[in-house]
Structures are given as C-alpha cells and as structure tokens.
Interface confidence: medium
C-alpha cells in the first residue's frame, strides 16, 4: 500500500510539474490561495508558516497536502478549518523552495492542485565595506569594488554613487557585483566621493564614503620578470631582468624572492624608470630553486599591482660563466607542461647571436668546399665524413624539422626543472633563433576542498583586482594602441589560495565575503581549453594559454608583438583564482590578433572576429599541429 501511495505522489508531482513547465509556479491556475507568513522572502533561520486555502467548486477537501520541491510534507501540518491548513517550518534554512498545496476531494480520483508559490530565505545585506576604486593603466575605466559581506542568498543589488567634489554632480550605477565606470564619463574634475548602497527584499545598507582623486588611484601596467642569469664573479650573483609597459614616470617596485623550500619572503624595493629593462642583482645560494615576484605602484600612491606570476630560477651547482634562464612562470605545476619558444631578442645576448651566425656561415662555406671535394673523391668523402661528424654539433646533422629527434626536446624532457613527467607531446615550433624557453604549466582542476561555509568570511588580505568581482572577473588583455579590452570570464571568487601557508599575497582586490559554493553558483563557469586538445583542463590559466599559444604562432606578420607582453602582463589575476567547475557557454573571447593567426595557419578557417565559438576552435585545432611539421 505504501508503495502505491508513493507512486501516486510521484504521478501527482509529475503531473503538476508538467502542467507548470511552460510558465513555472507563477503561472499556474489556482483553485484557492497559498500564502507565507511572515513573507514570501524572509530571513534565513526563521520559523515560517505556509497557509493553504482551498476554493474548489463542489469540493469540501477531505485532506490538504503540502509539497516542497515536489516532495510531500508529512509533518507539522495543522488543519485550521474546512478549507484551510497550515504548514509550519522551524528554522527554515533553504535559500529557495517551490511550495504548492493540493486537496483530496471526495469523488475525485486524484489530488486537485490548489496553488503554488516560490519562497526564498536569505539575509539582509551587510554594510558594504572596503570600497575600493582603481584605474588600471590603459583601461580607460575606473573599477570600483567592495566587500559585499556575508552571502545573502537572495537577489541583492548595489547602487554605486559617484559624486564630484568639484561640481557636486552625482551619478549612480546599478550593479550586482563590481562596477566599471568609463573615465570619460567622469567629467566632474578629479576628486570624487564614492559609496555603495546594498539593497534586497530584507533590507538596505550603505557603505562609508570613499574619497578618491583620479590621479591617485592609477595602477601601472603590470611588471613582468622575463629572465634570470647567474654570473660567476668572485661571489656568484644572479641578475633578474624585468620590465613593464607603463608610461608612468615615477614607479616604485618591490621584488620578493625566496627559496622554494622557505616560508618567508625577502623583499627588495626599487625606484624604477621603465625606459629600459630593469636588472636586479641578488646574491643567492648555489644549487637552490628560488621563486621571484615583482609588483609596482606609482610612487607615493596607494595601490599596488598584484604580484607578478611566479618566476622560478635554479642557481647552478658549480657556477659557469653565465647561466641564463628565461620565462619560468609557474601556474602551479600540477598538470600538463608545454614548452613554447619565444623569439625575443635579448640585448645582452645579441653579440653571442652574431658570433654564432658568423660561425655558422664560415662553417657552411667550409662544408660546401668539403662536400664538393667529396663528390669527386668517394674514399676521401667517407673518411672526412667521420671526422666532420665528430666536429660539428649534433643538432646540425639531425633532421631539424623533425623536432621529435631534437636534442632540445630531449633536453627538455630530461630536465626535470622544466618539464613534468606527465607532459604530453611537445609542440615546438622550429626557429633558428631560440633565445628563450618559456614554460607553461596548465593546472588540473583541483577540487575546492577548502570550501568555506555558506557564510564565508572576510579575507584578511587585500586583493586589488579580482576582489573587485563578485562572481565575474574582468580579465584585461591590454593592447597598447587601443587600451585594455575587457574579456569577461566568470569564475569562483573563492579566496585566492595559492598556497596553504598563505604566504603568497594575492594583490588583486579582495574577493567578496561570502563566495558561493561551486556547487550552487549558477554563474560559475568552466573555461574552455585549447591546449593542444587537452580537454580535461579546467583552469583559468587556459586563458593565459591562448596568449602563450600566440608566442608559438608569433613567427610572421600575423601576430602583433604586443600580444606576448599583454598576455604576460596580466597573468596574475588569472593565476590567483580557483578553478571553476561548471561549463561556460560555447564562446570564448580571443584577441583578434590571435584569431587572425589561426586564419593564417589554416586557410579553411571561417573569417571570424573576437567572439569565437569554441566548437569551431576545437574542430580546427588539430590542424594547428601543422606547426610541428
């Protein structure tokens, strides 16, 4: 009998669900009335009563039933009179529920729907605090963010008030998270008051006012460490090369470094003029892996950049004259490693390059003469062949286009410093001038096992960029000609936990207080990935990877030289976020320059612009392996 009842429950639930499927609970035809006390939207944890009153023709309900999310409630139901019943919930903690009630009418075969209602519980907004406004150099926007406080669970809107202290004109911007305000629209001089009002059905709060001066809130274009070299002087010293595209004259920077085994950072401060590449000297222990990061601010101003991405350098055991290592940015080395080659011309290496070129020319002439002799004298030919093979570097007589045979690849595969054991096929584009090897780690999706409670806490640390964003983060990929182009990626704003010991300060702006669980955030998105058909990688760093790919493609006219810088410039805010866990709509934003590269690689590609559907990319991506060949 129980089984029969359960089946009927299911039939009724399905029947009602199907009858609602076109309009939802709000569009059902009611034969009565359902209401909630104290209200349809109420404070989480309250005791609530749901009343159901039947008004069905020719029906004196034998019984009134309540359903929550399609499941019949069996307890705490009180019949008030012939037509009305009450369902009581103690300490209601569900953010959303769909309630409906039915009546058992005499002579009716099945329950009759009376009415339904969606109910919501949550919290009034906290006072927004830590209101912060910054202007990223080249962006053309003032980005304002705040700590929203604890998760409200209900629709909460924020009104950002911007009031000119000079003209007293006030502008208001409605948003559900952070706000980007075009600097062009800030016509009321340089000084403003900014404050944020938070409002939802349960209450309204207003932040303290933040006074800003537009000149004081500019964050310089990101500083990037490009390479490191260790020089054998009386005391071996390591030189770190770093640069920024900033046009700001007076810039103060900090470089922090530590052995990877250490907890504590050493910090060096610099007053910098970026008219040339910066060189910073460090006296480090031999045979130790160090990690470096740099950040800058306009001298005397309030806001710092985020720390640059991690740059690793291992000091040699016995120091040669110069050991140079370039671009060892690590994105938490937990998965696929792809070595890409950048053909940057480093000033310090140019003389070496010229020497090598001259040597090769002389060598080629010699080989030509010897081969001519060889044509006419077979015995001489075989004799000299052995001697030449002993003399010339091995890479010269290898099948150069076949990079699988290349010692460069073998070296990379053997060198544990650069490559993970589980790295997939190396994709190396051959170019005669290999000056820098950049390592990209594409992290696996890690489960967020440190998930916070629903009422997630306020982080202690300042995060000046992606805190800015509630569930959305704008990733700026700057083009020096046109300013920043915001590319929106939704991802979990859960803390920026790069490491368990909290030693890496993510200087992107603080994430909101109560980050949503990855499981219940409808806006959490997985980022499509293009890393040479590696389809299981769900990390934001894939966004970086698109840029890194442009380094591989950056062999001809198809790629602007800015791309490389711009991608490297802004990696940190991507690095410092947890991997999301759901799927993004099949559209990914790529720099137009990159898309044009793809077009050159394969003529069959449709002509498309920055909005680039993922499925097209995937279908054409295998063809990019042409690069290998």
């Amino acid at each position: 009998m129980n089984q029969v009842t359960i089946q009927w429950d299911a039939v009724i639930a399905l029947y009602i669900l199907f009858s609602w499927c076109h309009g939802g609970i709000t569009n059902i035809n009611c034969s009565g009335h359902i209401w909630v006390e104290p209200a349809t939207i109420f404070k989480m944890g309250m005791n609530i009563s749901i009343y159901c009153q039947a008004a069905i023709k020719n029906c004196q309900p034998r019984k009134l039933h309540f359903y929550k999310n399609g499941i019949k409630e069996r307890f705490q139901i009180t019949r008030i009179n012939k037509t009305t019943a009450r369902l009581w919930y103690k300490n209601f903690l569900e953010p959303h529920a769909s309630m409906y009630c039915t009546a058992e009418c005499p002579k009716h075969f099945q329950e009759t729907l009376i009415c339904g209602k969606d109910i919501s519980s949550g919290y009034p907004p906290d006072i927004p605090d830590e209101v912060t406004c910054v202007i990223y150099e080249y962006s053309g926007n003032m980005t304002c963010t705040w700590n929203a406080g604890k998760l409200t669970y209900i629709d909460t809107k924020y009104v950002v008030h911007v009031k000119s202290l000079e003209t007293e004109e006030e502008q208001q911007y409605l948003t559900s998270s952070y706000i980007n305000i075009s600097t062009d629209s800030l016509q009321g001089g340089k000084k403003y008051l900014v404050w944020v009002q938070a409002a939802n059905a349960l209450g309204m709060e207003e932040s303290k006012q933040l006074q800003i001066h537009l000149d004081d809130i500019v964050i310089p274009s990101a500083a990037v460490i490009s390479r490191a070299e260790t020089i054998n002087a009386t005391v071996p010293k390591t030189i770190i090369y770093w640069d920024s595209q900033t046009t700001i004259e007076k810039v103060s920077c900090e470089m922090r470094y530590k052995a990877t085994t250490n907890q504590t950072w050493n910090v060096k401060e610099f007053d910098t003029n970026f008219t040339y590449v910066q060189q910073s000297e460090f006296y480090l222990e031999p045979n130790i892996k160090y990690v470096f990061q740099v950040r800058c601010q306009e001298t005397g101003k309030r806001y710092w950049q985020p720390w640059s991405s991690l740059f690793f350098h291992k000091t040699p055991e016995t120091v040669p004259q110069v050991t140079s290592k370039a671009f060892q940015h690590d994105t938490w080395n937990s998965g696929l490693t792809v070595a890409s080659i950048s053909t940057g011309h480093l000033t310090s290496d140019n003389r070496g390059d010229i020497g090598l070129l001259l040597g090769m020319i002389v060598f080629a002439v010699m080989l030509s003469i010897l081969s001519l002799i060889g044509i006419f004298n077979r015995s001489f030919r075989t004799g000299i062949k052995r001697r030449i093979l002993l003399l010339i570097p091995k890479w010269l007589y290898e099948d150069i286009p076949n990079m699988k045979n290349s010692n460069v690849v073998k070296m990379l595969q053997e060198n544990s410093e650069l490559m993970n054991n589980n790295s997939s096929e190396q994709v190396l584009y051959v170019d005669p001038m290999i000056t820098e090897i950049k390592e990209i780690f594409i992290p696996e999706h890690k489960p967020t096992d440190y998930k916070k409670e629903n009422t997630g806490p306020l982080e202690t640390r300042d995060y000046p960029q992606n805190s800015l964003f509630d569930n959305t983060t704008v990733v700026y990929i700057p083009d020096l000609n046109t300013g920043y182009k915001p590319q929106i990626s939704n991802f979990l704003p859960e803390g920026s936990h790069l490491s368990n010991n909290n030693e890496i300060t993510s200087l992107t702006l603080k994430p909101p207080v109560d980050s949503l669980d990855s499981g219940n955030n409808p806006r959490l998105q997985k980022h499509p990935n293009f890393a040479f058909s590696v389809s299981s990688v769900n990390s934001l760093s894939n966004t970086i990877f698109l840029g890194e790919l442009s380094l591989i493609l950056n062999q001809g006219e198809c790629s602007s030289p800015d791309i490389q810088n711009s991608v490297e410039e802004e990696t940190t805010m991507l690095l410092e976020n947890d991997s999301p866990s759901e799927t993004i709509p099949e559209q990914t934003l790529l720099p137009d320059e990159f898309v044009s590269c793809l077009g050159i690689v394969n003529e069959e590609l449709p002509s498309i612009n920055t909005y680039f559907p993922q499925n097209i990319l995937e279908s054409h991506f295998n063809r990019i392996s042409l690069l290998e060949k």
């Epitope: 906290d126 910090v267 409670e453 806490p457 202690t460 030693e503």
Partner: antibody
C-alpha cells in the same frame, strides 16, 4: 613563532600625542590585517582600529575616529598607532593584534600590551 | 553597535570540573563569535573562532557552540593553567565588540 613586540606607551597630558609601535616577526607581515585593541582595568577589551594587509582599508571605532591614525610599514614589519588629542578616557593598556586568515575570525595573535596614561 | 553580554562576571570551579561560560549578542552574529583567554599577567590568546573552531595550539578540552545570538565556551576538564578571564568577541559587523569577560577562579 608569531611575535608582536610593542613599544611607545607612557604618560601624556590631555590633548597631547603619542605614537605606539608594534614590531612583528615570525610570519609574513604583509599577508595579514592588523588591529589595535585597548583595555581599561576591570573592563573588556575594546577594538579601536584595523588596517588591512596592504593598508588599502583602514577602520576606526567611533571613539577614536579623527584622533587616532593606524598605519603600517610592511617593509619594516611594523604597525603604528598615532594618537593625538588624547583624553583621560584613552588611558588603557593598548594591544596590537594580528588577524587570522579572515577578519571575522578575530585576533589570532596579541602583543603583550603597552600602557598609555593620559593625566594632567 | 552589537553589544556582547557575558552575564557571569566571575565563576568558581574546581580542577577537573566541566565549566561553561556563556555569551549573548544583541543581534544575530551568524556564528562569527570568537573566544579569548587573558591570563592574570595580561597575555591574551585566541582560543576559538567562528563559534567552534579551535585555534592552533589550543588544547582539545576547550570547545565552543551556539548560533544566532547565544554562544558558549566549555572547558571539559579544568586545569590549573586555565585559570584566567575569558572574553567573547563578535566578528560579524564593524565595530568588532567584546564581552566584559568572565573571570574563572578556583574554588
């Protein structure tokens, strides 16, 4: 081991000024928000000021707003509290405190305190 | 401001006793309740944060519970070194506020 070494307390006349210092060691100073908490005899502690790890955010209790300034020098691992227009009711033991990973989670580590006496 | 009330200003107990100290907030503080121990020499230590989480290095005889506005700290097996004053503090809303303290003494 986390250590917060305080200094700068003393006797000062009403209306006078004083600057307290708190030298931090045993942790990455620039990773944590810091606060000043004071306590008068036979009373509970009173939070008076907070500064986020990079000094982006500064908060004060109403009792000291406009008179006290919290600041930090991350390069020197030092927290400061500059007190001006001192009143007799500011007489207390002043503690510097380091927050945990989350501000809501309270003051994870405390200094030993420094006494400030405001009296004519 | 949220007012934190510790109704018991002093409490006498014997070694080995189970001791409970209570704290009430003037409004819901969403479990952001922290407990501190202040020794007679003035040293202050965080014991419990977020209602029930033990701070590192704190003995497991300390525990916390509560929700909404009512919270408590329990010492399951009182030891000599636990003789101190205990303060609660809310971390939910600025300004952060403390209770007046409960002084624990030996019988």
């Amino acid at each position: 081991e986390v250590q917060l070494q305080q200094s700068g307390g003393g006797l000062v006349k009403p209306g006078g000024s004083l600057k307290l210092s708190c030298a931090a060691s045993g942790f990455t100073f620039s990773d944590y928000g810091m606060a000043w908490v004071r306590q008068t005899p036979r009373k509970g502690p009173e939070w008076i000021a907070f500064i986020s790890n990079l000094a982006y955010s500064v908060y004060y209790s109403d009792t000291v707003t406009g008179r006290f300034t919290i600041s930090r020098e991350n390069a020197k691992n030092t927290l400061y509290l500059e007190m001006s227009s001192l009143r007799s009711e500011d007489t207390a033991m002043y503690y510097c405190a380091r927050h945990g990973d989350y501000r809501n989670y309270g003051f994870a580590y405390w200094g030993l305190g420094t006494t400030v006496t405001v009296s004519s | 401001d949220i007012v934190m009330t510790q109704t018991t200003s002093s409490l006498s107990a014997s070694l080995g006793d189970r001791v409970t100290i209570s704290c009430r907030a003037s409004q819901d503080i969403s479990n952001y309740l922290n407990w501190y121990q202040q020794k007679p020499d003035g040293t202050v230590k965080l014991l419990i944060y977020y209602t029930s989480r033990l701070h590192s290095g704190v003995p497991s005889r300390f525990s916390g519970s509560g929700s909404g506005t009512d919270y408590s700290l329990t010492i399951s097996n009182l030891e000599q070194e636990d003789i101190a004053t205990y303060f609660c503090q809310q971390g939910n809303t600025l300004p952060w506020t403390f209770g007046a303290g409960t002084k624990l003494e030996l019988k």
